[in-house]
Each structure stands twice: as C-alpha cells, then as structure tokens.
C-alpha cells in the first residue's frame, strides 16, 4: 500500500511575508476535477496572492472555485476580510452569538462548541452535521474569540471569523484553529462507520478521521450514513483533500509526507496544503 | 415501513387559521435522527419549503421566514403526529400541503399523501 | 436564500433514450442535494441524496453528479414509468429550497 511509504521530513517557518487568507480553501491548489467540462471559473493563487481563471471540468474539484472574479475577491483577498480590531472600545458580538445552540436536522454525532447567552460561555455540544445555525465552532478557543467577552468586558478577536458566504451553511468557516488538523471537507468524512439495518455484506469503504485514512468495511445494503463510498478513491477523494496541516509560526513539525507539498504563510501560522 | 397521513380541511376562509396535522407510523415523531416538516406545492410557487422540528433532547423549529410570523409547527408526542398552523391566510397560501420526514441524511425521504387547502370565501 | 435553478424546464424523449436534466445553485452547495421524482397526484419521491447517493429502492438507470453549484441527473435508458416531473432541493442551509421543476415528456 503505497499510501503507507510516507518519509518523515522537518519542516520549518518561511520566508514569506504573512498572507493573511479569510478561508483555508483559498490556499488550496486549483483543481479542474475528474470531468470533461470547459467551465471558466475563478480560483485564488496563493502565490501571485491574486484571483485568477482556471478551466474546471464541471464537478468535484474543491472549494477554491469561484463563479466570477469579484466573488473570488471577496472570499479570498485580504481587502475584503470581515476584521474585528482589538480595541478599549466595547465590540458588538455577531448576532449568530445569541442565538441558542442548534444540533442541526442530521444524525452525525460532531462535538461543536456554542455560545451560551445564559451562561456568557462557550460550551460543548453535538452537531449533527448539517445545518443548524451559526451558533457553531470548531473549537472553544474560536468560540471564545468571537463570542465571549474579555476580561474587561471586550471583545477579544483581532481577527474575526468570515462565516461561509451560505447562511447556516453545513459547516461554519473558521479562520482560527489551534488543532495540529483542521477539516475542511464533507462533516460526514468525520462520522463513524454505519453498516446500516439491512443484512447484506457489500465492500465499502469509509474515512477513518482518527488515521486519515479509507479503510474497508461491510455495508448492510441500507441505512447507514454518508461516509461510504463504493472505491478506496471516491473516499480518498471526497475527505482526504479535506485535511490541512498546521503548525504555529516559527515552530517545528516532524510530519509525515508523500507527495510535494505547497507551502505558504497564512496569518500567524503555516498551512501545508496537500497536493492530492 | 414508514407513512404519513395527513388530515385537515379543504377550504379555509381568509384571515383565518389554516391547521394540518400529520400522523406518524413506523418512526416517532420524537425520534433523535428525523426530522418532520411541512411543504406545500402551488402553480405559481412550485415546492416551497415551509418549516422543520426535531427533537434532539429538546424541541427545535426553523421556518420559511415567508410566512415565519404567521406558522407554527407543533408536535404531539402522545399522538405520535405533528401539526401545521398558518394564520391569517389569504388567497395565495392555496396550494396542496405535504407533510414529510427527513431522514438522518438530511433529505425528505417519506412524504403524506398532500391536501389541497384552498383559501376561499 | 439559495436559488436553485433547473435546465430545461420541459423535455420530450422516447423509451430507452438517455436523458440529462440539470441543476444549477446560485451558491456553493457542495454536495447537498437531492433529486426528486413527482408524478401527477402524488407526493414528490426521493431519488438521489447526497447529489450521487441512490436512495434504497431506486432503479440504478437513475443516476446523479456534480458539487458546488452545478448538478446533473442522469436517467440512462428511460422507461414508461420514468414520466413525470424532477425537482432538485439544496440541504446547504435554511431555508431549504427546491428548483422549480423539469417535466419529462413522451415524444
């Protein structure tokens, strides 16, 4: 399994002068997908730091795909960046921060956090894996920077969220993540495998996120849920291209590597974004 | 095996309240991995999405914000059906209602048989 | 909201042909889309989720593809059943909205 022929490599901080990126996805490579379409679409260039056209076959591919080039602009340039200044003045909270925590219509069980308006915290809940509301992080520290108050009663982001452009979309956008991994992909990549109420024994494959990797399993026939895929390559395509590695600047990281990866310097921390 | 059976009058008057209810078989309207809804279905509007509740330890709703000031979707545990309350109807919420349920995937996977609802005085 | 728009709005085939119905969101959607089949006097019936997912008991002719914002279903030889009108629904995010339709007609 070549999958497992990974060298290990130091990787350390850059050159580059900070680009500062409102979405993880901007940083990921163009990608024109398995079809045969011509559709002219708009991706970000994490080098030329610029919106620019590529042809896209017409399905899969990521989300650094813009229909036009002022769309691109707006999702992926820095002039555009929603920011919330640090600042002695009181900050507004967003409004999804009053709103109460929302599990959202699926079955996938995701531990999310929310802000509690009660409370003036940011607490732990499950997230069923679509919609819901905006009322959803990652993570408590990206929680607490949007949401909660600082010590004096301030807002304390010096960079805010810029929530997906879809209102109570599948999966709020974060701009910070502290975790080493950060998933960008379909949310059910993260669910369990689910063999499903019926009795027969079909090979399947699912996305085991705790290893990063597809892994076989048998499938009833029916039920079950979304993390399951007819081919090794369908999983590998719809949830590994999800992954972004991160590491925090001027740090050091033993990780593992396959293929080249692009490197570019994002806010205060690196993002190694794999070419799949 | 799932179904739905929907209930509830014809002919509505303006202004007044329009009220559905959906009965339940084969899944519980409590249930933590559906999700029950209403959609109605008109010429001029084609399927329009009107409102969602599930449970998931306790009660939540999103509705259309076309019509968010006037519906109300409740469930009824004891029955095992949920309902539809639209208030101050006029001639343009005609149309035939569905109740539906949404699976864990998200989808509406089992739907009633629709009620035509005409708003008429 | 997110508008979901069908192509064409109607069309004519014969038994055993291939036929292509689209759908186009005004946003991305990623995969969250389901393709419905509504024959006259019925209820809608779930095709397709996950914009390639095929529900349990769904003939495998019918087919669907696509993420981001532009969708295709695919019914690969059609049979005198298959008559009827397709609706596409996003899942994305509230409200959750359908297209606006495509009948399939007997040329």
């Known amino acids: 399994d070549s999958e497992e022929d990974e060298e290990h490599t130091i990787i350390t901080d850059t050159e580059l002068p900070p680009l500062k990126l409102m979405h993880s996805f901007c940083a990921f490579k163009a990608d024109d997908g398995p079809c045969k379409a011509i559709m002219k679409r708009f991706f970000f260039n994490i080098f030329t730091r610029q919106c620019e056209e590529f042809i896209y076959g017409g399905c899969e591919g990521n989300q650094n795909r813009f229909e036009s080039l002022e769309e691109c602009k707006k999702m992926c340039t820095r002039d555009n960046a929603n920011r919330i200044i640090k600042t002695t003045l009181q900050q507004e909270k967003p409004d999804f921060c009053f709103l109460e925590e929302d599990p959202g219509i699926c079955r996938g069980y995701i531990t999310r956090y929310f802000y509690n308006n009660q409370t003036k915290q940011c607490e732990r809940f499950k997230y069923g894996g679509c919609l819901g509301n905006m009322n959803n992080f990652e993570t408590l520290e990206e929680c607490k920077n949007i949401c909660e108050d600082g010590p004096n009663g301030f807002q304390v982001d010096n960079y805010g969220t810029q929530l997906n452009a879809v209102n109570n979309s599948l999966t709020p956008q974060s701009t910070k993540v502290p975790s080493l991994f950060e998933f960008h992909g379909p949310s059910w990549c993260l669910t369990p495998a689910d063999r499903g109420l019926c009795r027969a024994n079909e090979n399947r494959f699912y996305y085991n996120s705790v290893i990063g990797k597809c892994r076989p399993f048998k499938y009833s026939g029916c039920g079950g849920n979304e993390n399951n895929f007819t081919s090794k390559q369908e999983c590998l395509r719809a949830c590994k291209k999800g992954f972004i590695q991160r590491i925090s600047k001027g740090g050091l990281i033993k990780t593992k590597r396959k293929r080249k990866k692009q490197r570019v310097k994002i806010a205060y921390e690196e993002i190694f974004v794999k070419n799949m | 095996q799932v179904q739905l059976q929907q209930s509830g009058p014809g002919l509505v008057k303006p202004s007044q309240t329009l009220s559905l209810t959906c009965a339940i078989s084969g899944d519980s309207v409590s249930s933590n991995s559906a999700a029950w809804g209403w959609i109605r279905q008109s010429p001029g509007r084609g399927l329009e999405w009107l409102g969602i509740i599930y449970y998931r330890s306790k009660w939540y709703n999103h509705y259309a914000v076309s019509v968010k000031s006037r519906i109300t979707i409740n469930p009824d545990t004891s029955k095992n059906q949920f309902s539809l309350q639209l208030n101050s109807v006029t001639p343009e919420d005609t149309a035939v209602y569905y109740c539906?349920?949404?699976?864990?995937?998200?989808?509406?996977?089992?739907w009633g048989q629709g009620t035509l609802v005409t708003v008429s005085s | 909201d997110i508008q979901m728009t069908q192509s064409p709005s109607s069309l004519s085939a014969s038994v055993g042909d291939r036929v292509t119905i689209t759908c186009r969101a005004s946003q991305d959607i990623r995969n969250n889309l389901a393709w419905y089949q509504q024959k006259p006097g019925k209820a809608p019936k779930l095709l397709i989720y996950a914009a390639s997912s095929l529900q349990s008991g769904v003939p495998s002719r019918f087919s669907g593809s696509g993420s981001g914002t532009d969708f295709t279903l695919t019914i690969s030889s059609l049979q005198p059943e298959d008559f009827a009108v397709y609706y596409c629904q996003q899942r994305n995010g509230f409200p959750l909205t359908f297209g606006q339709g495509t009948k399939v007609e007997i040329k």
């Open positions: 539906a349920r949404s699976n864990w995937s998200g989808y509406f996977d089992y």
